[in-house]
């Protein structure tokens, strides 16, 4: 699987999950998030050669098409597969709120 | 929606579904598919600016991150959202077989 266990331990050029730390205040301008200060959102990148973690029949077909027609602009793209939530603390007035934001952390990638 | 109805009628630079005809024999080397000769597989391409048909909270965050940090390599990617099946005819020896291949035709795209 193209997950953090594999990708973070290997120098992988092809589609894989990459570490990306996002600071809410500095990188997003989200001053309202009090905790955490930031988090590892991670992201997916890298070429999608034929059959690499193909998401659907279409991505398999497109990967083969791209292999046999290398000048073509159509090719699968490396995108998130498994995502995890992130729990944040913020305030509404003086009242603290805790909320779980879904799909915030990329754990693995796929070619779609 | 970034679907064929919208994308095929507009000159859209950002993420959209694009027409792509694939000939099974010529483009894929699949001699075993006898009908159809080929089909519109289509593909997704184009930049994913902040909030454009964002698939998850992560793609929204990444889109914003990329807007505020334009030098960053991390950005959402334009990939298939809705896909449709394709029915094909092939032969196993002298016996005709009809099979519905799932997720073969891209009907719309999203930023993931």
């Amino acid at each position: 699987a193209l997950d953090t266990n594999y990708c973070f331990r290997n120098l992988e050029e092809n589609c894989c999950v990459r570490p990306l730390y996002i600071d809410f205040r500095q990188d997003l301008g989200w001053k309202w998030v009090h905790e955490p200060k930031g988090y590892y959102a991670n992201f997916c990148s890298g070429p999608c050669p034929y059959l690499r973690s193909a998401d659907t029949t279409h991505s398999t077909v497109l990967g083969l098409y791209n292999t046999l027609n290398p000048e073509a602009s159509a090719s699968p793209c490396c995108v998130p597969q498994d995502l995890e939530p992130l729990t944040i603390l913020y305030y509404v007035g003086r009242t603290p709120k805790v909320e779980q934001l879904s799909n915030m952390v990329v754990k693995s990638c796929k070619c779609s | 929606a970034l679907d064929t109805n919208y994308c095929f009628r507009n000159l859209e630079e950002n993420c959209c579904v694009r027409p792509l005809y694939i000939d099974f024999r010529q483009d894929l080397g699949w001699k075993w598919v006898h009908e159809p000769k080929g089909y519109y597989a289509n593909f997704c391409s184009g930049p994913c600016p902040y909030l454009r048909s964002a698939d998850t909270t992560h793609s929204t965050v990444l889109g914003l991150y990329n807007t505020l940090n334009p030098e960053a390599s991390a950005s959402p990617c334009c990939v298939p959202q809705d896909l449709e099946p394709l029915t094909i005819l092939y032969y196993v020896g002298r016996t005709p077989k009809v099979e519905q291949l799932s997720n073969m035709v891209v009907k719309s795209c999203k930023c993931s």
Partner: antibody, heavy 119, light 111 residues
Framework: EVQLLESGGGLVQPGGSLRLSCAAS????????MSWVRQAPGKGLELVAD??????????YYSDSVKDRFTISRDDSKNTVYLQMNSLRAEDTAVYYC??????????WGQGTLVTVSS | DIQLTQSPSSLSASVGDRVTITCRAS??????????MHWYQHKPGKQPKLLIY???NLASGIPSRFSGSGSGTDFTLTISSLQPEDFATYYC?????????FGGGTKVEIK
């Protein structure tokens, strides 16, 4: 260009044997099923024997009229298909065509070879 | 085995005539939306030639005056305007199941 060249036909006595050959070129012979179709004088086309590719274990078919007397075989290294005809009868007199069916239709045909069974 | 019955078995027509030949199968030769019936032209001393494959698809190099239609058990070959070179015997053939079989043929003669 697809070419199918039959040979081996001729005059033979009832009960005798003949071996027809069909040399193929211009297509991926290994991938496709090959057939022998005949036309007896004043009659229609009849599929006599058929052999599919190695992918499908060289499965063969014979019409009831030739079963146990005719044998179809192929040599993929030589791009050739054969029809071994034993215990020939007068009713086997016909033009024999070699043909290739990439799908469900016989797309290409040889020029035919005449087999005459007569005493 | 699936039997194919062609009608008429012979016909006389003139150059320029519209000619229709039918082929009826003893059971359906269609599977899903695919119609597994094919048509051939056969002239004396020549090898048969594929005209139409899968009911309605014109084979390579065949003039557009030839057309095919039908589904299930009933199929038609039409020559829109008969030409001198079209006088021949026409056969239908199915590939719905093994064994593939031919129809008895329809001889098109000059009136």
């Amino acid at each position: 260009e697809v070419q199918l060249l039959e040979s081996g036909g001729g005059l033979v006595q009832p009960g005798g044997s003949l071996r027809l050959s069909c040399a193929a070129s211009g297509f991926d012979f290994n991938s496709y099923g090959m057939s022998w179709v005949r036309q007896a004088p004043g009659k229609g086309l009849e599929l006599v024997a058929d052999i599919v590719s190695k992918t499908y274990n060289y499965t063969t078919y014979y019409s009831d009229s030739v079963k146990d007397r005719f044998t179809i075989s192929r040599d993929d290294s030589k791009n050739t298909v054969y029809l071994q005809m034993n215990s020939l009868r007068a009713e086997d007199t016909a033009v024999y065509y070699c043909t290739v069916a990439p799908g469900g239709s016989f797309d290409y045909w040889g020029q035919g070879t005449l087999v005459t069974v007569s005493s | 085995d699936i039997q194919l019955t062609q009608s008429p078995s012979s016909l006389s027509a003139s150059v320029g005539d519209r000619v229709t030949i039918t082929c009826r199968a003893s059971q359906s030769v269609s599977i899903s939306r695919f119609n597994l019936m094919h048509w051939y032209q056969h002239k004396p001393g020549k090898q048969p030639k594929l005209l139409i494959y899968r009911a309605s698809n014109l084979a390579s190099g065949i003039p557009s005056r030839f057309s095919g239609s039908g589904s299930g058990t009933d199929f038609t070959l039409t020559i829109s305007s008969l030409q001198p070179e079209d006088f021949a015997t026409y056969y239908c053939q199915h590939s719905r199941e093994s064994p593939w079989t031919f129809g008895g043929g329809t001889k098109v003669e000059i009136k």
